[in-house]
Interface confidence: low
Amino acid sequence: MGRARDAILDALENLSGDELKKFKMKLLTVQLREGYGRIPRGALLQMDAIDLTDKLVSYYLESYGLELTMTVLRDMGLQELAEQLQTTKEESGAVAAAASVPAQSTARTGHFVDQHRQALIARVTEVDGVLDALHGSVLTEGQYQAVRAETTSQDKMRKLFSFVPSWNLTCKDSLLQALKEIHPYLVMDLEQS
């Protein structure tokens, strides 16, 4: 698409130093669509407009990246800049593109666990085996027992996913590793979807 990336860059380059700093701070707290990860604070605060544009596009893709940039600019009271992005969005058909592809599948730069949350809740049946693999290293005793206490596989997976927002990447990797061992064909299927 290209044009969206250029529009984001134009908008960010129009910000003063203080405004760019404020944009980054707001980006750290803005509500994200489900399935999308947050750009790490340490990296984010060091970026100039070009690096930030690249990061926005790599994390959120062009359509959602454009939308997110507009949201933050509006929140900062920079309506004019946001309107310019709105025009680009409408001209490029980004609205249709964003609406036609679910957030889960577009989050290609997100972790497998975040990308495929709904499918994993629906399709993982051997939850207890997954829990045993995560017990101690990822899940605390209380979390482990809380998931075990649920009755159906889907409820167990929902409960498990309620802990994911506080996980770091190692934890998510551990879950993926457990899934690969217990449900290899499901993981293969989702990786190719």
Epitope: P40, H111, T140, E141, G142, S166, L169
Partner: antibody, heavy 117, light 111 residues
Amino acid sequence: RVQLQQAGAELVKPGASVKVSCKASGNTFNNYWIYWVKQRPGQGLEWIGRIHPSDSGTNYNQKFEGKATLTVDKSSGTAYMQLSSLTAEDSAVYYCALLSLYAMDSWGHGTSVTVSS
Amino acid sequence: DIVLTQSPASLAVSLGQRATISCRASKSVSSFGYNYIHWYLQKPGQPPKLLIYLASDLESGVPARFSGSGSGTGFTLNIHPVEEEDAATYYCQHSREFPWTFGGGTKLEIK
């Protein structure tokens, strides 16, 4: 950022035990793993283990199992590490650290434990 | 356990020049595109301070003269240009599996 406060020094006799404390400021204590790290004088760093204040879930480095016991007091926002059957090898600075996301990004100033008769 | 070997054990670098520290792991500490190596500096009498996490991400507030790179088993910390205040011991640490381990440290002296 959460601040971690540790007592400066402890002098203990061989064979005795010592309980090192780590008090966290702020109300986010229950959300993060607390890690413990050992550093002998002039030496490198060794990871002892970790504890989650929400339910006292722990993981230990096998090397320190039986030597270190990690506990927390949620009401005071304090993590503890008890070291037992102390020998000269246990003389070191012991740090507590907090893992907020990827790495240990908040550290206490360390407690120096000296084992001497 | 994963063993991290740092080299050199010590180095002396002139003010304004580049310091390069290597960290080699006994097995891969990378997984699904993430590199679980972190870098810390430590000055005498102080706790370690996080500089870089996940091999290349700069911790908030750390000057941009610090940078990290690498994947798999080989990682590098670069400091350029080196400043007086960078004199310290630098450690790499992995968080790929338990137990987490640290490299033996590299002492940087400024000439």
